[in-house]
């Protein structure tokens, strides 16, 4: 549900990833959107401590920009999703090995990955930076 408001990011986890003074979308389906979204990122972020140095910065950028989406202010504040191309690059290039392991473990029910269940968008459902450049955010 895309009901929410735009606000400056005031958290800690995504400080180094999000642009300074970035306007992010805070989702009012949470009682305390700022805290809830920060907790989501924090939980998934911990999983990223074990991934490869190639994957980690790309995954962190994807994670922060997916949970704290850029916000387009207006009469109806609107979240701007990540472009599908960036999403694909993180999943299939930068984090290909990690992604395979995570998918496999999740399918076999070995663990419930916070990152997998809560924090990773389905790339094919995202707008393309080529066909609709203003509809999505470039990382």
């Amino acid at each position: 549900d895309n009901k929410g408001y735009c606000a400056q990011y005031r958290g800690e986890v995504c400080n180094a990833v999000l642009a300074k003074d970035a306007l992010v979308f805070l989702n009012t389906s949470y009682a305390d959107p700022e805290e809830a979204q920060e907790l989501l990122v924090h939980t998934a972020w911990n999983e990223l401590k074990v991934v490869s140095p190639v994957c980690r910065p790309a995954a962190e950028a994807l994670l922060c920009n997916h949970i704290f989406q850029e916000c387009s202010p207006g009469v109806v504040p609107t979240p701007i999703p990540i472009c599908r191309e960036y999403c694909l690059a993180v999943k299939e290039l930068f984090c290909a090995k990690e992604w395979l392991v995570m998918e496999e473990k999740t399918h076999r029910g070995l663990y419930r990955s916070e990152m997998h269940l809560l924090s990773v968008p389905e790339c094919s459902k995202l707008p393309s930076m080529h066909w609709d450049p203003t509809a999505c955010a470039r990382l």
């Epitope: 191309e85 690059a89 999943k91 299939e92 290039l93 094919s124 080529h130 066909w131």
Partner: antibody, heavy 117, light 107 residues
């Protein structure tokens, strides 16, 4: 595993049209864009265009605009590329390729199209 | 359209040599550039993605660098199996465009 299987070689006369197909398997067909790239004998790679199989949006290189048409059939997981008004310079190997720049790239085996009178 | 100019178009080198191939874009493409290797009669194979990242399974003697308009592919110590044609591809915007290729031959 991901596979892209292209249709067989074609010999065409100048002025005719050719339709090359590319059948995808081993992945969710509608989740990935498909590119068409060609290579004339002894020449380099040339990007022709792209199709989003989910919905059929296309983008073509200027050079082929008006002469090329890319289509997708989700029921058979097949994309096709039709090139019309063929001339001898269109003699080339035509490749379909999934996600050239951004995701895991996979290529078809190539289809040789010969244009000769 | 963005033009990609590759240089040299052909070069000869010996096994063990360090080889550098350059690709120039006619406008800023950030780091959205890939490098492909093609051997005669084979389909192209991607070596480098997003300018400087090594594709899984590609030997570490291959490396890529650059951003904006100037990019390089380096092979640190040429092996017999590296003699092939190399292409750069910009994927910053449609239409995607390839460089004209660099044919690497044995000296």
């Amino acid at each position: 595993q991901v596979q892209l299987v292209q249709s067989g070689a074609e010999v065409k006369k100048p002025g005719a049209s050719v339709k090359v197909s590319c059948k995808a398997s081993g992945y969710t067909f509608t989740s990935y864009y498909m590119h068409w790239v060609r290579q004339a004998p002894g020449q380099g790679l040339e990007w022709m265009g792209i199709i989003n199989p989910s919905g059929g949006s296309t983008s073509y290189a200027q050079k082929f605009q008006g002469r090329v048409s890319m289509t997708s059939d989700t029921s058979t997981s097949t994309v096709s590329m039709e090139l019309s008004s063929l001339r001898s310079e269109d003699t080339a190997i035509y490749y379909c390729a999934r996600e050239l720049g951004w995701g895991s790239d996979y290529w078809g085996q190539g289809t040789l199209v010969t244009v000769s009178s | 359209d963005i033009q990609m100019t590759q240089s040299p178009s052909a070069m000869s080198a010996s096994v063990g040599d360090r080889v550098t191939i350059t690709c120039r874009a006619s406008q800023d493409i950030r780091n959205y550039l890939a490098w492909f290797q093609q051997k005669p009669g084979k389909v192209p194979k991607r070596l480098i993605y997003i300018a400087s990242n090594l594709q899984s399974g590609v030997p570490s003697r291959f490396s890529g660098s650059g951003s904006g308009t100037e990019f390089t592919l380096t092979i640190s110590s040429l092996q017999p199996e590296d003699f092939a044609t190399y292409y750069c591809l910009q994927h910053n915007s449609y239409p995607y465009t390839f460089g004209q290729g660099t044919k690497l031959e044995i000296k």
